[in-house]
């Protein structure tokens, strides 16, 4: 502890001019005081001021105002200041002298004699009013106060605390009349060496190292660190723990990147026509009537469902068609014959039936031929028959349809996975992506089909933490670690929902 | 009980940068209470505080030397480093790490042994 | 920038008391701490908050800090004592030590 008892002289009067002894000053007693402080005694005895000592220069002649004074010699209230902890009583003696000698340091004179003396015995807490007192004996009467204040920088009730108010990064404070901290705005703590965050900031993904600020954990982001930071390159896909992709509707893949609503994102099918998805990145047009071509972009020719019967041949016009009848045959369609069967109208060995008593007939055709005179030789490839770009051919009787790559089925129909022709090598897991098959090698293999054999194997020291499974070949570091439910980190190296110490920053 | 041990090469050219590194064992370096630093030494004269980190990677740095110095924190390893770049014979010094205690008004408890660093072509 | 003076040596004899200074301006706003270093070894927490000892430091060991002038003070003084002595204090977030005195013990 450390404080200073105070004591202010304010009066002393010797109106006579006398001696304790009885004689008096010539010519006037000039004055000095002693001051002895020392621990309570209920009876003061001679000994040392075991709480401090100290004299003053001559003060006055017989009475006297003593006035205050800051500095120098005669300061005014007397310092008495302690290094321990205040016990709250004391004893206090004043005696009064008079000199011959020095005015300056009358301690040092011979031929001192005593004036008066008084002495105080009692308690007296620290705080800063002072206590005011009057002695007065037969002959002399001395006014004075007193207290006892804490040193710079010690508090409480017996100065015995010491705090310093501070700024710097181990505490951030001012002090307390108890001595206890007071943080400064923005920090906290035992020590106010621990900022307040920016409001709000999550406590376990998010600190700071001054108020009203946000850093986030690997792993985390935005203002307040409340949002997870999804897998490097996780296209259409969102997460509710860091590096996780949890793919939106209609995406799949490890990293939401393949399409799995080809029709509703693209709208690939022109002209009406009807979009079916089949698998990623795969669909299939189905063409209204009049129109042909992978995406149905292609308008057919208005005569090309062959309209015109009997031979007529069909012309295209501006939104319809027109038909040239043969000699024999009228009709929109040519569909009127003003033929029988007395003028052998039936080709290619077809048999005539007499219709409507002779006014007409119909023709009956062998096999591969077709028409009303079955005039026309069967091609199975006019319906377009064959999906997704796939060229029709005629085979006899019947007729085959050629698929472009990627298709099959009787009509091309089919979408056929990029994957299904296995085309990755050596155990390569395949994934079907916008551009093509990508291929997750095991380990010990890479490229693009895993057909080149490592020497260095990326997984081979073990980069995966916490039981993760690492695959090499699919990322610019050569590995990938997928995590086991709990994990996350590129290596899987932070478990879920760590508790507020975890050392996050590597 | 804490230990703190330096480790760094012994000798540096002039002009390039000199590394070091501080391991923690006994304690954890993200404890709350504690700031990690560097002193140097140069022989047969004085201390000189270089900087010091907290385990969130807040720096603090002597601004005759702040120009110069990076100190960076690695929890997962326990360890601290420094880094003074441009060195010059003026540089060379033993080089403690230290432990800085919040509850100790920010008084070194713990240092470690030190490290001579010699700049010399 | 902020700087510690100490005096380059103090001699004491054996059994008797040395005081060592370290000036500063308001020093005494400050908490002072005090490091005693051997040849050849690492410094050595003495005194912290001006007059605190770390557990393990003998009570001959003690300090105070008023004004512009931290002290520390070895009473009944040993040859084990000889050592050099820094004080050390914070300016706001740099640390800052004073030049150093050497104790011998004669």
């Known amino acids: 502890g450390s404080g200073i008892f105070q004591l202010r002289l304010q009066e002393f009067v010797n109106q006579r001019g006398m001696l304790a002894n009885g004689q008096s000053c010539e010519p006037g007693c000039r004055t000095f005081f002693r001051i002895c402080l020392k621990h309570f005694q209920a009876t003061f005895s001679e000994g040392p001021c075991t709480f401090g000592n100290v004299s003053t220069p001559v003060l006055g002649t017989n009475s006297f105002v003593v006035r205050d004074k800051n500095s120098g010699s005669g300061r005014n209230p007397l310092q008495l200041p302690f290094n321990f902890t205040w016990p709250g009583t004391f004893s206090l003696n004043i005696q009064a002298w008079h000199t011959p000698g020095d005015d300056l340091r009358p301690e040092t004179s011979p031929g001192n004699s005593l004036i008066s003396q008084i002495i105080i015995q009692g308690s007296l807490a620290v705080g800063k009013i002072w206590r005011t007192d009057e002695q007065n004996d037969t002959l002399t009467r001395l006014s004075y106060s007193y207290r006892v204040i804490c040193s710079d920088n010690y508090y409480g009730e017996s100065c015995s605390r010491l705090c310093k108010k501070r700024d710097d990064h181990f505490g951030h404070y001012e002090c307390q009349p108890d001595g206890s901290l007071s943080c400064l705005p923005g920090w906290t703590g035992k020590y106010c060496d621990q900022p307040i965050c920016l409001s709000g900031c999550h406590e376990q993904n998010g600190y700071c190292s001054k108020p009203d600020e946000c850093i986030c954990r690997p792993g985390w982001q935005g203002r307040l660190c409340n949002e997870c930071i999804p897998h490097n390159g996780c296209r259409h896909g969102t997460c509710s723990i860091p590096w996780q992709c949890a793919c939106d509707e209609g995406w799949g893949g490890l990293f939401c990147d393949q399409d799995l609503n080809y029709c509703t994102h693209h709208s690939p099918c022109k002209n009406g026509s009807t979009c079916s998805n089949s698998g990623p990145k795969g669909y299939t047009c189905t063409c209204l009537p009049g129109y042909t071509g992978e995406h149905c972009e292609l308008g057919l020719s208005k005569c090309a469902s062959n309209p015109c019967r009997n031979g007529g041949s069909c012309k295209d016009q501006e939104n319809s068609y027109h038909c040239l009848c043969p000699p024999g045959y009228y009709g929109q369609h040519c569909e009127h014959s003003t033929l029988t069967c007395a003028d052998s109208p039936c080709f290619n060995g077809g048999s005539c039936r007499e219709r409507n008593q002779g006014s007409s007939y119909a023709c009956e055709c062998p096999p591969n031929f077709t028409g009303s005179n079955c005039e026309k030789k069967v091609d199975r490839c006019t319906s377009n028959p064959c999906a997704n770009g796939g060229q029709c051919q005629n085979r006899g009787p019947s007729r085959t349809c050629r698929c472009r790559p990627g298709f099959t089925g009787t009509h091309c129909e089919l979408h056929i996975s990029d994957c299904a022709r296995s085309p990755c090598a050596h155990g390569g897991t395949c994934h079907d992506l916008e551009n093509g098959p990508v291929c997750t090698c095991p380990a010990g293999f890479s490229g693009r089909r895993c057909e080149v054999r490592i020497t260095h194997d990326a997984c081979a020291s073990g980069p995966c933490f916490n039981g993760a499974t690492c695959y090499t070949g699919l990322s610019p570091n050569n590995f990938v670690c997928n995590c086991p439910y709990g994990f996350v980190g590129s290596r899987c190296e932070f478990p879920v929902g760590l508790p507020p110490s975890f050392p996050w920053v590597a | 009980e804490v230990q703190l041990q330096e480790s760094g090469p012994g000798l540096v050219k002039p002009s390039e940068t000199l590394s070091l590194t501080c391991t923690v064992s006994g304690g954890s370096i993200s404890s709350s209470s504690y700031y990690w630093g560097w002193i140097r030494q140069p022989p047969g004269k004085g201390l000189e505080w270089i900087g010091d980190i907290y385990y969130t990677g807040s720096t603090y740095y002597n601004p005759s030397l702040k120009s110069r110095v990076t100190i960076s924190v690695d929890t997962s390893k326990n360890q601290f480093s420094l880094k003074l770049s441009s060195v010059t014979a003026a540089d060379t010094a033993v080089y403690y790490c230290?432990?800085?205690?919040?509850?100790?008004?920010?008084?070194?408890?713990?240092w470690g042994q030190g490290t001579l660093v010699t700049v010399s072509s | 920038s902020y700087e510690l003076t100490q005096p380059p040596s103090v001699s004491v004899s054996p059994g008797q008391t040395a005081s060592i200074t370290c000036s500063g301006q308001r020093l005494g706003d400050k908490y002072a701490s005090w490091y005693q270093q051997k040849p050849g070894q690492s410094p050595v927490l003495v005194i912290y908050e001006d007059s605190k000892r770390p557990s393990g430091i003998p009570e001959r060991f003690s300090g105070s800090n008023s004004g512009d002038t931290a002290t520390l003070t070895i009473s009944g003084t040993q040859p084990m004592d000889e050592a050099d002595y820094y004080c050390?204090?914070?300016?706001?977030?740099?640390?800052?030590f004073g030049y150093g005195t050497k104790v011998t013990v004669l």
């Open positions: 050390q204090a914070w300016d706001r977030d740099t640390g800052v």
């Open positions: 230290a432990r800085y205690d919040v509850s100790l008004g920010g008084s070194s408890d713990h």
